[in-house]
């Protein structure tokens, strides 16, 4: 049985204020059943960045087509970057539970930092 891997290829992503940042995340299996969510930070105080199923995330778009079948690409784009967006971003697989989903596996994280302003 293939064990699920959460792949976040970039350890560090340098971004520019006002631009769009792309955070990559791919998975190697559709199992276990359950959604993938994006967070900034870890622990109980982490911030939910994107949940495709519910919520309103006006600055976030998905890289893959949301009508695509059996999607394994959970990359996102965050527009209009500000200094407040810096931090480490994690894509996290949840296992479907009833009533609550349970965290199953997290990617290694991508640190978003501000790069030098273009001259």
């Amino acid at each position: 049985e293939e064990e699920l891997q959460m792949i976040q290829p970039e350890k560090l992503l340098l971004v520019t204020v006002g631009k769009t940042a792309t955070l990559h995340c791919t998975v190697t299996s559709l199992l276990p059943v359950g959604p993938v969510l994006w967070f900034r930070g870890v622990g109980p105080g982490r911030e939910l960045i994107y949940n495709q199923k519910e919520g309103h995330f006006p600055r976030v778009t998905t890289v893959s087509d949301l009508t695509k079948r059996n999607n394994m690409d959970f990359s996102i784009r965050i527009s209009s970057i500000t200094p407040a967006d810096v931090g480490t971003y994690y894509c996290v697989k949840f296992r479907k539970g009833s009533p609550e989903n349970v965290e199953f596996k997290s990617g290694p994280g991508t640190e978003m930092a501000l790069g030098a302003k273009p001259s």
């Epitope: 559709l30 199992l31 059943v33 495709q52 949301l66 009508t67 296992r95 479907k96």
Partner: antibody, heavy 120, light 108 residues
Framework: DVQLVESGGGVVRPGESLRLSCAAS????????MSWVRQAPGEGLEWVST??????YYADSVKGRFTISRDNSKNTLYLQMNSLRAEDTAVYYC???????????????WGLGTLVTVSS | EIVLTQSPATLSVSPGERVTFSCRAS??????IAWYQQKPGQAPRLLIY???SRDTGIPDRFSGSGSGTDFTLTISSLQSEDFGVYYC??????????FGGGTKVEIK
């Protein structure tokens, strides 16, 4: 081509057991969730159970009596049915789950079904 | 549990006619609806998923629409091979996955 072939159906008495099998081919069996859906004679479709990796889900009507399992080395899905009742009489379909977007499962391929009859 | 109500229960139609099926959910399911066709003695066949996306190989006379609680499956011009029973299914909130009771399409 995706193929799902069920077997193991038959006639049993109330309280007895039966084990259904579903042989799958034509896709990467181990990375997909799989389900059983049943249809009583002349009735509509009723979801029975789904299995992911080792995560399993059941309809209330079968919880505690039915057990879904899979053997990825054999590309086979199973449904162990214990304490069978007359109301379990149905055609049992094996179905491959498909996801869309970032979550949400439906059934994109179905087997032809196997008939289970529970009668005294 | 989300209840899906399909109407009408039966439709009597002539080939070439436009046919519309309704599926109403007891609560918001966004666009997490699939439609299946089942012919007598056969397994169900996926037609539409995500409310409006046609499955591979499904003729374009089949179309789906709707979001929230009200969904529609339309066959623009019914062919003789389209007779059978049509089911909707929700996958927004499960377990359990739930199906509508079906709409039977018969020859007028």
């Amino acid at each position: 081509d995706v193929q799902l072939v069920e077997s193991g159906g038959g006639v049993v008495r109330p309280g007895e057991s039966l084990r259904l099998s579903c042989a799958a081919s034509g896709f990467s069996f181990s990375i997909y969730a799989m389900s059983w859906v049943r249809q009583a004679p002349g009735e509509g479709l009723e979801w029975v159970s789904t299995i992911g990796a080792d995560d399993t889900y059941y309809a209330d009507s079968v919880k505690g009596r039915f057990t879904i399992s899979r053997d990825n080395s054999k590309n086979t899905l199973y449904l162990q049915m214990n304490s069978l009742r007359a109301e379990d009489t149905a055609v049992y379909y094996c179905a491959k789950d498909s996801t869309v977007g970032w979550s949400g499962d439906f059934f994109d391929y179905w087997g032809l079904g196997t008939l289970v009859t529970v009668s005294s | 549990e989300i209840v899906l109500t399909q109407s009408p229960a039966t439709l009597s139609v002539s080939p070439g006619e436009r046919v519309t099926f309704s599926c109403r959910a007891s609560q918001n399911v966004r666009s997490d609806i699939a439609w299946y066709q089942q012919k007598p003695g056969q397994a169900p066949r996926l037609l539409i998923y995500a409310a409006s996306s046609r499955d591979t190989g499904i003729p374009d006379r089949f179309s789906g629409s709707g979001s929230g609680t009200d969904f529609t499956l339309t066959i623009s011009s019914l062919q003789s091979e389209d007779f059978g029973v049509y089911y909707c299914q929700q996958y927004y909130d499960w377990p359990p996955f739930t199906f509508g009771g079906g709409t039977k399409v018969e020859i007028k």
